[in-house]
Interface confidence: low
């Protein structure tokens, strides 16, 4: 079985993903705004997230505005809402999994129960890693893609928000977590053939005398 | 709720500069820009310019230029549009509208004055 | 200038069919995430009313008969089905730039 420092790591660093991901999802800075063309109405910097945007004056005053309605919302943002969300209970199940399966915890008594619980873990925070991931990159594809499409004026032209990086980290976190406690191999069960070994030891001492 | 008024017409001489106003109430003036927008008789619509009451920072169709001049009185929650040496051409409907941006800067038309008809005759 | 070109110039349907009015940019008004194109009803000495904004987001108030697509360079706005109090002028704009330029305006009639 692996050892419990790596059991530990990997639930460390799946719950710091886990954290990442909130942060991700909570922070409006998905996307920014970089207006610079004279034929633009405005020269505030824009901010956007997942629920909401903020214009951020050149005197550093912030005001946020959460959005409307969700009808309203893009396509990509409505879906990167749900595979975000879907990532968050995702990851919290997994904590919820490793916290059981933990070899520090006594929730299962079987060793065996608890390495396929912590595998079973690593696994769901592989996919919360994978549901972050997806949303993230699907954003910036889009923001690179707007920036260097000509026909696209500069004042509607993105760039990639902290938020997309701290997604991005989260994702690592994720997957790297989840990576580690899939390494968890259940015990190989070793007394069927012991049993059977001091069985046959001791009946070939019989046979010996 | 939110109400654009303008004066229903206006008659000017040909050369003598004219100046349209439009009262905004039920909201905050200043947080909102002020446009004016153009329909000659049986036509289309023409974006002319628009103002930010908050520090009167102006965009302009290059096209008016030399025509139109925007203005605001904080005060009395009042934009003005001057239109200097009118000539027939400039015979229309003005409204006013306000813009409010979806997510802070996705801008759309959503208020409107009902417009002020300018004759210019001598 | 972006130039939005309106077809048809008028436009005669029965009462509870389908209308189709189509705007062509003369360049994209879309990013991957937003199209800068709306739509407006204008009565007889009224002022325009928003009908629909960032092409398909029907604004509140707006009957549901009324709906909006597509991106790029090209939109339509569609009524179904058709009312008579929907006798009226329509207009796109868009607000990718300034200026902010109205199609030519397409007049729809009853038959």
């Known amino acids: 079985m692996a050892s419990m420092g790596l059991q530990v790591m990997g639930i460390a660093l799946a719950v710091l993903g886990w954290l990442a991901v909130m942060l991700c999802c909570a922070l409006p800075m998905w996307r920014v705004t970089a207006f610079i063309g004279s034929n633009i109405v405005t020269s505030q910097t824009i901010w956007e997230g997942l629920w909401m945007n903020c214009v951020v004056q050149s005197t550093g005053q912030m005001q946020c505005k959460v959005y409307d309605s969700l009808l309203a919302l893009p396509q990509d943002l409505q879906a990167a809402r749900a595979l975000v969300i879907i990532s968050i209970i995702v990851a919290a199940l997994g904590v919820l999994l490793s916290v059981v399966g933990g070899k520090c915890t006594n929730c299962l008594e079987d060793e065996s129960a608890k390495a396929k619980t912590m595998i079973v873990a690593g696994v769901v925070f592989l996919l919360a890693g994978l549901m972050v991931i997806v949303p993230v990159s699907w954003t910036a594809h889009n923001i690179i893609q707007d920036f260097y499409n000509p026909l696209v004026a500069s004042g509607q032209k993105r760039e990639m928000g902290a938020s997309l990086y701290v997604g991005w980290a989260a994702s690592g976190l994720l997957l790297l977590g989840g990576g580690l406690l899939c390494c968890n191999c259940p015990p190989r069960t070793d007394k069927p053939y012991s049993a059977k070994y001091s069985a046959a030891r001791s009946a070939a001492a019989s046979n010996y005398v | 709720q939110v109400q654009l008024q303008q004066p229903g017409a206006e008659l000017v001489r040909p050369g003598a500069s004219v100046k349209l106003s439009c009262k905004a109430s039920?909201?905050?003036?200043?947080?909102?820009?002020m446009n004016w927008v153009k329909q000659r008789p049986g036509q289309g619509l023409e974006w002319i310019a628009m103002?930010?009451?908050?520090?009167?920072?102006?965009r302009l169709n290059q096209k008016f230029k030399d025509k139109a001049t925007l203005t605001v009185d904080r005060s009395s929650s009042t934009a003005y549009m001057q239109l200097s040496s009118p000539t027939s051409e400039d015979s229309a409907v003005y409204y006013c509208a306000r813009i409010d941006s979806y997510y802070g800067y996705l801008f759309y038309f959503d208020y409107w004055g009902q417009g002020t008809t300018l004759t210019v005759s001598s | 200038d972006i130039v939005l070109t309106q077809s048809p110039a008028s436009l005669a349907v029965s009462l509870g069919q389908r209308a189709t009015i189509s705007c062509r940019a003369s360049q994209t008004v879309s990013t991957s995430s937003y199209s800068y194109m709306h739509w407006f009803q204008q009565k007889p000495g009224q002022p325009p009313k928003l009908l629909i904004k960032f092409a398909s987001n029907v604004e509140s108030g707006v009957p549901a008969r009324f709906s909006g697509s597509g991106s790029g360079t090209d939109f339509t706005l569609n009524i179904h089905p058709v009312e008579e109090e929907d006798i009226s002028t329509y207009y796109c704009q868009h607000s990718w730039e300034i200026p902010w330029t109205f199609g030519g305006g397409t007049k729809l009639e009853i038959k």
């Open positions: 039920g909201y905050t003036f200043t947080s909102y820009w």
């Open positions: 103002i930010h009451p908050s520090d009167s920072e102006i």
